[in-house]
Interface confidence: low
């Protein structure tokens, strides 16, 4: 819907990117069939979506991973949607957990997270996983986005 | 929200329909507690949601299926949300994969897909699965929809 | 987006609350990083989100649970998003089912439900599960919300 200059649409959808980094924060890219409505939302350092306007946002992430119970730690695979607001500590907004599969060499599973949250100007959201090496980066399997209400 | 004639709400939510067809494309119906806001979005041939207006849409699908590892192929159950734009090839927007359960006769699992995408006038979205015979059609288990931002 | 007094934003996101009640209806609270846009949506009796305005709403729920196949009933874990409209019977809008894990003591799994539905003034939505004692209430694991289109 055309909201006018005062109230433009703000939305993003970014695609997972395999990374050699050992960090648990997933990496994303503006590639494939991605969405970046305008400069009121940006992908920073390939890892976080940052918004310029305060308001309510529906934020979502999907993570597909392949793991095996014997080869993994006893703890489940956990995906977390996290928030970093300027001058504030990071906080978890949403989490999902899936126990590892007994399938060999690994069993694929998909997690979907989504919710409505108030974001401040300059707030960033990012996705954390327990083991990034298990994440599936095939077309469409792992993605991250938001839309301003 | 009333957006006026210039900018009407556009939204749809359709319900899965068992089908004797052997196609991997899921079938849907306007039945039960479905949503079809107006003729700016339509369900075509019981298989695809087609939009008349260009814009950003949040598109989602949920698929519940019942499968068994021994009775199924080694490949996981995959649900794909696909896009067909006029004059363009089909493309995958989102996918989710779940390894088959070891439960007998079959183990139920649910997959949820959702994301924000730019659609052109006349664009259609549909849902593909690896084995439609495994999909659960009980009330509320499998559905498909979109909303225009 | 500022819609003005005539058309305010309506959105909610509430957080799961452990309950000693034996009911299958999940309990929620306005705690942690919750959202309650205004009094046009309210959390009633800690169990249902009730809206004052008619319209199309995107409604979602996420449930994380921990269960074991041997310790649970044969039936899968089912989460249902249900609607109670004034003067009408309850009805299921969405359901998801996951077979219990073979992991011990229990295996965690996450379910996500979401869809667009027409709600009448005074309509309430709530979440039912087959076994509330299996639900995970750690930060971000289980939540429930809606937004008015």
């Amino acid at each position: 819907m055309q909201k006018g200059d005062q109230n433009p649409q703000i939305a993003a959808h970014v695609i997972s990117e395999a990374s050699s980094k050992t960090t648990s924060v997933l990496q994303w890219a503006e590639k494939g069939y991605y969405t970046m409505s305008n400069n009121l939302v940006t992908l920073e350092n390939g890892k976080q979506l940052t918004v310029k306007r305060q308001g309510l946002y529906y934020i979502y992430a999907q993570v597909t991973f392949c793991s095996n119970r014997e080869a993994s730690s006893q703890a489940p695979f956990i995906a977390s949607l996290c928030l970093k607001s300027p001058g504030r500590f990071e906080r978890i907004l949403l989490r999902a957990a899936n126990t590892h599969s007994s399938a060999k060499p690994c069993g694929q599973q998909s997690i979907h997270l989504g919710g409505v949250f108030e974001l401040q100007p300059g707030a960033s959201v990012f996705v954390n996983v327990t083991d990034p090496s298990q994440v599936s980066h095939g077309t469409g399997f792992t993605s991250f986005g938001l839309l301003k209400l | 929200m009333q957006k006026g004639d210039q900018n009407p709400q556009i939204a749809a939510h359709v319900i899965s329909e068992a089908s004797s067809k052997t196609t991997s494309v899921l079938q849907w119906a306007e039945k039960g507690y479905y949503t079809m806001s107006n003729n700016l979005v339509t369900l075509e041939n019981g298989k695809q949601l087609t939009v008349k207006r260009q814009g950003l849409y949040y598109i989602y699908a949920q698929v519940t299926f019942c499968s068994n590892r021994e009775a199924s192929s080694q490949a996981p159950f995959i649900a794909s949300l696909c896009l067909k734009s006029p004059g363009r090839f089909e493309r995958i927007l989102l996918r989710a994969a779940n390894t088959h359960s070891s439960a007998k006769p079959c183990g139920q699992q649910s997959i949820h897909l959702g994301g924000v995408f730019e659609l052109q006038p006349g664009a259609s979205v549909f849902v593909n699965v690896t084995d439609p015979s495994q999909v659960s059609h009980g009330t509320g288990f499998t559905s498909f929809g979109l909303l225009k931002l | 987006m500022q819609k003005g007094d005539q058309n305010p934003q309506i959105a909610a996101h509430v957080i799961s609350e452990a309950s000693s009640k034996t009911t299958s209806v999940l309990q929620w609270a306005e705690k942690g990083y919750y959202t309650m846009s205004n009094n046009l949506v309210t959390l009633e009796n800690g169990k249902q989100l009730t809206v004052k305005r008619q319209g199309l709403y995107y409604i979602y729920a996420q449930v994380t649970f921990c269960s074991n196949r041997e310790a649970s009933s044969q039936a899968p874990f089912i989460a249902s998003l249900c609607l109670k409209s004034p003067g009408r019977f309850e009805r299921i809008l969405l359901r998801a089912a996951n077979t219990h894990s073979s992991a011990k003591p229990c295996g965690q799994q996450s379910i996500h439900l979401g869809g667009v539905f027409e709600l009448q003034p005074g309509a309430s939505v709530f979440v039912n599960v087959t076994d509330p004692s299996q639900v995970s209430h750690g930060t971000g694991f289980t939540s429930f919300g809606l937004l008015k289109l």
């Epitope: - | 329909e17 068992a18 119906a29 039945k31 039960g32 507690y33 019942c66 006769p105 659960s136 059609h137 009980g138 009330t139 | 039936a75 249902s80 249900c82 009408r88 019977f89 309850e90 009805r91 299921i92 039912n128």
Partner: nanobody
């Protein structure tokens, strides 16, 4: 046009059995969950049982669990309710309904068949 036609009701003694049938037409029977609800004299509607399209998964109200069995024959577009160990409190008009939306709330109803449990 959707039509649901129940049969099999009648008078039975406590502890007895009855089998209700519901012949469905006008829709794709195999695509839908089906259910039974009942209305006792002077009372509201009570959900009794539901069955998934495949017939694999069934649901029962606590009041009938272990005594009633729902089933379906998709080749005949027919729904059944086998009622055993009947009690006086099972006296009601039984309705076949499509589809099951939680424990109550249906799109279509039959005309009902009366079951009376009395000695």
């Amino acid at each position: 046009e959707v039509q649901l036609l129940e049969s099999g009701g009648g008078l039975v003694q406590p502890g007895g059995s009855l089998r209700l049938s519901c012949a469905a037409s006008g829709f794709t029977f195999t695509s839908y969950e089906m259910g039974w609800v009942r209305q006792a004299p002077g009372k509201g509607l009570e959900w009794v049982s539901s069955i998934e399209p495949t017939g694999i998964t069934t649901y029962y109200a606590d009041s009938v669990k272990g005594r009633f069995t729902i089933s379906r024959d998709n080749s005949k577009n027919t729904l059944y309710l086998q009622m055993n160990s009947l009690r006086a409190e099972d006296t009601a008009v039984y309705y076949c309904a499509k589809p099951h939306f939680t424990e109550l709330g249906f799109d279509y109803w039959g005309q009902g068949t009366l079951v009376t449990v009395s000695s």
